[in-house]
């Protein structure tokens, strides 16, 4: 019988006492088959966090800073369910940190050093941590003690709680740093105020400290919010302005064997029963004998944390950028205006072997980082272990629902300007084989399909887009009788027909050989009834373009298309008989990262891209002999994208609206993970 | 197409050295970028070093230092030497011209280089 007792960790006499009393409730409300409750009794979080990384307890709630703590090797737990507050119709479970200014002040983030600064409190969040840690590395040396470092970089502070003594600049904007509210500028509102009063330039505290301090709109227009970016943002756009986006409390259990889906049967059982209004005995978000005792008194319920959230991507970016500043204290030997290496995510073994090529030309510009799949490249580039990527429309949407950026294009087509104008788009077609002569697009319901990937534009989402209008259900492996959709659940039927050997098959990255444009053109050519590709993708393998024993013999004349009509077309009339037309694919990366990504990626295609003209003697950056390594083959050079540089401009309404409704049919885990984080 | 031979590997003790050749059946003269990789037990290929035509070169962290690579044409060989050798060096090492651009799984016997006390 497996072990259904969640050992729950608590640090205090009281945080016990309410334990077992959660304990004693749950017994008489949970049959005796479902899950129950143990209580341990440690002295801190520390050890909380010790005793359920070694199997002694199972689950504490944390704040953020100590779940980076959790996080950390040797503990390595995860976040596995939230405390949300607010109402259940618009869960908030995190909050966002910001710099507040007044609006004529006309600095930005990198000019702060010589302002006067707000701070809630030192060693707070908001207040403290996340800025400091931010700035740490513009920060004067020695920043050691951080307190001086910080006086010294400032003109003059109000940083409650701070030693007044040691660092009188800290408190030069309220005498004597006072750490309760009877310092008018402690707290959230405390710092506000000592902006609002001229005391300080910059206030550093949370999105909603505003609001519930100026409830005027006319008031808050006053107001601005500095950016990461050297950009200023109206304070209501905080979710694209903020210093980092904060988890509020979360419980966390072991990565492996850490029982989250227990956890999770347990406390949403807990909140049904004992939640905000439910019971007068028993109260999970209430603490008689204290505050805070096992989760926040404020807090309203739980949301479930997506397994495919680990730590660093739960508390973001920025946030353990801060942490991990202020704790390590390293920083670069000297700030230069220099770029770093762009870290280039690489898929699989083949990537890898042209990104090295690569790598070994640029003479220290690129670096290769390798991951398995395109969704595991996006996390690294979301966490700071990769810079940068080109990516399918349908990726490009992950990745900017994941906060990442595009910030060049790829283009397809000769122009005397390729680089200033950025392409249309590709179109995306379904090709037959001549000889299945009654195949249309109103009867592809049992024959066999070919998919670039499952996610990706021409090879899934267009396609199973215009299906599921038609279907008005998602289970596309039951529409079709079989095929090749890389990506799939393996023991789908959309897997049966890949070529992939053991645990490669049906894996979305070149281990498959029916992944991708050419992969799924092979997979009709031996297997399939329809493939759904780019237009270029018959010429670009027929005619002995492709080498491949499997292609070389091929003819063009032997493939046709289906129209959405009902008819079919010879292969090169695409532009009156295609299924939509697919953004280009786009270099992305993160906000942090978009100068230099922009920059170095230029240089790069001027040394390696289309201009060099013999590729066997030379490295090109483009080419790949059809494999589409790193970038499509055909990509004639990386383009502008001028105004639309985030994911919604960039790949247009349509598309992003196409993409929303197939949503529902969605099963990228990493998409799940990162609208939880941006609803 | 460029064959590639491999040589030079051997037991060594921590902190000794060694040098790796790499023998092509024609002209490297014209090869845009040479490379050795190593393969440890149970581990995936990593990029030791590599070098241009023009002379660059690119090295592993890991190796940083310890390890030069060079080319010489007109023999048609590339070599690399190994210095204070660690036993994470333990690896068997492969040499490629990229030629085979990047997706035929082909690599040669390569060369086993122990390191052990």
């Known amino acids: 019988v497996p072990d259904k007792t969640v050992r729950w960790c608590a640090v205090s006499e009281h945080e016990a006492t309410k334990c077992q009393s959660f304990r004693d409730h749950m017994k008489s409300v949970i049959p005796s088959d479902g899950p129950s409750v143990a209580c341990v009794k440690k002295a801190s979080y520390l050890d909380c966090i010790r005793a359920i990384a070694a199997n002694e307890a199972d689950a504490v709630t944390l704040d953020a800073g100590l779940v980076y703590d959790a996080y950390l090797a040797p503990n390595n737990l995860k976040p596995v369910v939230a405390e949300f507050y607010g109402s259940k119709e618009d869960p908030q479970t995190f909050y966002y940190a910001v710099a507040v200014v007044k609006k004529d002040s006309g600095f930005q983030m990198n000019q702060l050093r010589g302002k006067k600064s707000c701070h809630t409190g030192l060693g707070r969040s908001a207040g403290w941590n996340i800025p400091i840690g931010l700035l740490y590395c513009d920060l004067p040396e020695p920043r050691k003690p951080l307190e001086k470092a910080v006086a010294n970089f400032f003109s003059g502070s109000c940083a409650p709680c701070a030693d007044g003594t040691d660092f009188p600049q800290l408190c030069q904007l309220c005498p004597g740093c006072g750490c309760s509210t009877l310092n008018q500028y402690f707290g959230y509102s405390g710092a506000f105020k000592c902006l609002k009063d001229g005391a300080g330039d910059v206030a550093f505290v949370k999105h909603s400290t505003i609001f519930e301090n100026l409830a005027n709109k006319a008031d808050r227009d006053q107001y601005e919010l500095l950016c990461l970016d050297n950009t200023r943002k109206p304070v209501d756009e905080y979710k694209d302005c903020h210093l980092a986006q904060v988890p509020s409390h979360t419980v966390v259990a072991r990565s492996m064997g850490g029982k989250e889906d227990l956890i999770w049967e347990l406390l949403n059982q807990a909140q049904e029963h004992f939640g905000k209004d439910k019971s007068k005995e028993f109260q999970l978000f209430s603490s008689p004998h204290g505050k805070d005792l096992l989760f926040k008194d404020s807090a309203h319920g739980f949301l479930k944390v997506p397994p495919r959230m680990d730590a660093k991507m739960y508390l973001g970016y920025e946030y353990v950028t801060a942490i991990r500043n202020l704790r390590e204290g390293t920083c670069p030997e000297a700030p230069t205006d220099e770029c770093k290496p762009v870290k280039w995510c690489a898929l699989s073994h083949h990537e890898r072997l042209k990104c090295d090529e690569w790598s070994v030309n640029s003479v220290g510009k690129i670096e290769c980082v390798s991951a398995e799949t395109t969704e595991d490249c996006i996390a690294k580039i979301m966490n700071g272990e990769a810079d940068a990527m080109s990516l399918d429309g349908g990726f490009v949407y992950i990745a900017g629902k994941c906060g990442l950026v595009p910030v060049l294009a790829e283009n397809y087509n000769k122009s005397d300007n390729c680089e200033d104008t950025p392409e249309a788009g590709y179109f995306a077609i379904a090709v037959v084989k001549k000889s299945a002569s009654d195949l249309t697009w109103d009867n592809l319901k049992g024959k066999k399909s070919c998919h670039t990937a499952v996610g990706r534009t021409a090879g899934w989402n267009i396609p199973m887009g215009l299906l599921y209008n038609k279907i008005n259900h998602c289970r596309f492996d039951e529409f079709f009788s079989e095929g090749c959709a890389p990506g799939s659940k393996k023991d789908s039927s959309l897997c049966k027909l890949c070529m992939g050997s053991g645990l490669n098959l049906c894996e979305p990255n070149n281990k498959e050989g029916y992944y991708g444009y050419t992969g799924a053109f092979r997979c009709l050519v031996e297997k399939g009834d329809v493939a759904f590709v780019k237009h270029q993708t018959v010429p670009q393998n027929t005619g002995g373009k492709n080498p491949d024993p499997w292609a070389k013999n091929l003819n063009e004349k032997d493939y046709e298309l289906l129209c959405l009509d009902g008819t079919r077309k010879p292969v090169e009339e695409y532009a009156n008989c295609h299924l939509a037309r697919a953004p280009n694919h786009a270099v992305v990366t993160r906000k942090d990262k978009e100068a230099c990504v922009h920059k170095i990626l230029r240089q790069q295609q001027h040394l390696f891209g289309s201009n060099v003209t013999d590729c066997s003697g030379n490295f090109c950056l483009f080419r790949s002999e059809t494999k589409d390594l790193l970038f499509r083959d055909d990509t004639v050079c990386l383009a502008k994208l001028h105004d639309r540089n985030t994911y919604e401009k960039y790949l247009g309404e349509e598309y992003v609206k196409a993409v929303g409704n197939l949503r529902k049919c969605s099963t990228s885990s990493l998409l799940e993970a990162c609208t939880f984080r941006r609803p | 197409e460029v064959q590639l031979v491999e040589s030079g590997g051997g037991l060594v003790q921590p902190g000794g050295s060694l040098r790796l050749s790499c023998a092509a059946s024609?002209?490297?003269?014209?090869?845009?970028?040479m490379a050795w990789y190593r393969q440890a037990p149970g581990k995936g290929l990593e990029l030791v070093s590599g070098i241009t035509r023009g002379g660059s070169t690119k090295y592993a962290d890991s190796v940083k230092g310890r390890f030069t690579i060079s080319r010489d044409n007109s023999k048609n060989t590339l070599y690399l030497q190994m210095n204070s050798l660690r036993a994470e060096d333990t690896a068997v090492y492969y040499c490629?011209?990229?030629?085979?651009?990047?997706?035929?799984?082909?690599w040669g016997q390569g060369t086993l280089v122990t390191v052990s006390s």
């Open positions: 024609g002209s490297i003269a014209s090869i845009a970028t």
């Open positions: 490629t011209d990229y030629s085979r651009k990047y997706y035929q799984d082909y």
